[in-house]
Amino acid sequence: AGHLEQPQISSTKTLSKTARLECVVSGITISATSVYWYRERPGEVIQFLVSISYDGTVRKESGIPSGKFEVDRIPETSTSTLTIHNVEKQDIATYYCALWEAQQELGKKIKVFGPGTKLIITDKQLDADVSPKPTIFLPSIAETKLQKAGTYLCLLEKFFPDVIKIHWQEKKSNTILGSQEGNTMKTNDTYMKFSWLTVPEKSLDKEHRCIVRHENNKNGVDQEIIFPPIKTDVITMDPKDNCSKDANDTLLLQLTNTSA
Amino acid sequence: AIELVPEHQTVPVSIGVPATLRCSMKGEAIGNYYINWYRKTQGNTMTFIYREKDIYGPGFKDNFQGDIDIAKNLAVLKILAPSERDEGSYYCACDTLGMGGEYTDKLIFGKGTRVTVEPRSQPHTKPSVFVMKNGTNVACLVKEFYPKDIRINLVSSKKITEFDPAIVISPSGKYNAVKLGKYEDSNSVTCSVQHDNKTVHSTDFEVKTDSTDHVKPKETENTKQPSKSCHKPKAIVHTEKVNMMSLTV
């Protein structure tokens, strides 16, 4: 089965610059299929823009100005790229790649879409470091004692643009856990969002990860925020005396920075 | 030019109660095209649901039913037993791929129909209220309540800022909520909740025990730390493998 990945969840550009949006095809040979690009402007219908066929033929939708969009594909990396020249405010949209995927039964095809890349246009580059800044909240003792469950909360602040994806996994597992999240909220001209995960008592002694995808993450990789295991049988707490105990009474979380 | 027009912009549905979405074709006979349905969920993921010829996307066949009403020139999608996972925007789209002649392999989309999911009517349930803290940040967690109407108040004399609460459907079909704020006196912040003409306090759920916290961090440059050592860490962030982590008792 064909699968499409658009690694950039957003792409922020200043006016008149060039945007390059990538689409990675897996499960099917890119040179044996056609890749389609669609655009969804705010409040408008999703519209076909341009496609590149298995033999390299490019077809664009009528009414799309020539020279605005360029589409190509790189078989070595199984990637199709949509290039948008001289970006302007009317190019603000989410761009999806898509392909027809044959089903088991002969003659049955469905069109599958990538997750989309949102093109954002700013008048100026941002002055600030606008990667998501995380804060972690560990389960309250009351919750773990009374409900035999614990809630981890992952707060992300000071990021721009507003496009962000958050999911949760246990350490050493690729299974995505069922979590809940609030709406993305604007604070001045950056954004904040939080996501929370409630796990049963038996999972509290496992390490959990809040995984964050954002355009401005350092080095362009997903940020992994580690929630340490909680030993519910050992750890107790006096909510009325939050600073009373010596450090030796608690688990010590030691971090060794090995970055350059 | 053809146009696909959804019957409604927004359709509220209740968990477990069947719902029907309709999409009419203007300017052409619907029988000349294949109809497709897609769902876009939070995060923009466009998932294929149904295409004529009885083709369903993975996981959709049991809970969805697609149909064409040739006489009324419209496409129909039934959600047989909606769950909170079915919230999203639903799009009808058409193509003529495989119809022979001058076929079009591009999809022509209609505007989306926003499907919002609500719990079905049920007995009223009082929430549990818990407070979580880190530095100046305080989160009030309100669990498993019904109905939805609720007022969450973080009680503090030194508020820096507060955010609107997030209220979502819980996996059990009730509601959960979280309200966040920043306070200079976070240690003394409590949470009180008005629900169903009753007040519930976070202090009602506190357990008297004897130590401070689950973890105490050592500060590192790329780890967000609170100002006092008795608070939880701001975050332990692994980008590529910038940190090595060890826990010692």
Partner: antibody, heavy 123, light 106 residues
Framework: QVQLQESGPALVKPTQTLTLTCTFS??????????VSWIRQPPGKALEWLTL???????YYSTSLKTRLTISKDTSKNQVVLTMTNMDPVDTATYYC???????????????WGQGTMVTVSS | SYELMQPPSVSVSPGQTASITCSGN??????ASWYQQQPGQSPVLVIY???KRPSGIPERFSGSNSGNTATLTISGTQAMDEADYYC?????????FGGGTKLTVL
């Protein structure tokens, strides 16, 4: 009105650690968008940016000096503290603190400066 | 790391217009600020966000920024404008200063 005042030793010995305090009034460093920065200027030379701390307690350092610098704040005392380790005679300069206002994504420049404190590094 | 280049010195006659330039890679895509430093004094912000003047700064100070160059323009230059001028931009919350320009009013 907004004021900033640097304080600290006028003379430090090579290899020692310099600690400077910036005491400010007229604004709060817990207000969204506020930052305090340190800048230095060797005699007869250009301004050199060192570090900044923002309302969110995020800290940013000059790439060339980050291994030697630490910035911290005490919001209740309206103070920002700079420490610089392993001082050398080339670190002789006037050290300024300055306020920065912003919106989270954009800043409005270093709009108010302290009068500066001259630090000489000599044995 | 990002760099800003300024001419070491610029001369102007009283009443004339002085222009001080600051160049950096695609600087026009960033916001530029300008500071004036009189001898023995702390720097003073005279222009921020390319062309905005803080209150108390005379109207004769103006700024522009496009392409690779930001420009500080002082129209009707006065003797009191003789000072060092520094341009400044941002690189992901890090402050970058130019090397400074000595403005001499002849």
């Amino acid at each position: 009105q907004v004021q900033l005042q640097e304080s600290g030793p006028a003379l430090v010995k090579p290899t020692q650690t310099l600690t400077l305090t910036c005491t400010f009034s007229g604004f709060s460093l817990s207000s969204s968008g506020m930052c305090v920065s340190w800048i230095r200027q060797p005699p007869g030379k250009a301004l050199e940016w060192l570090t900044l701390i923002d309302w969110f307690d995020d800290k940013y350092y000059s790439t060339s000096l980050k291994t030697r610098l630490t910035i911290s704040k005490d919001t209740s005392k309206n103070q920002v503290v700079l420490t610089m380790t392993n001082m050398d005679p080339v670190d002789t300069a006037t050290y300024y603190c300055a306020r920065i206002r912003g919106t989270g994504a954009y800043y409005y420049g270093l709009d108010v400066w302290g009068q500066g404190t001259m630090v000489t590094v000599s044995s | 790391s990002y760099e800003l280049m300024q001419p070491p010195s610029v001369s102007v006659s009283p009443g004339q217009t002085a222009s001080i330039t600051c160049s950096g890679n695609e600087l026009g895509d960033k916001y530029a600020s300008w500071y004036q430093q009189q001898p023995g004094q702390s720097p003073v912000l005279v222009i921020y966000q390319d062309n905005k003047r803080p209150s108390g700064i005379p109207e004769r100070f103006s700024g522009s920024n496009s392409g690779n160059t930001a420009t500080l323009t002082i129209s009707g230059t006065q003797a009191m404008d003789e000072a060092d001028y520094y341009c400044q931009a941002w690189d992901s919350s890090k402050v970058v200063f130019g090397g400074g320009t000595k403005l001499t009013v002849l």
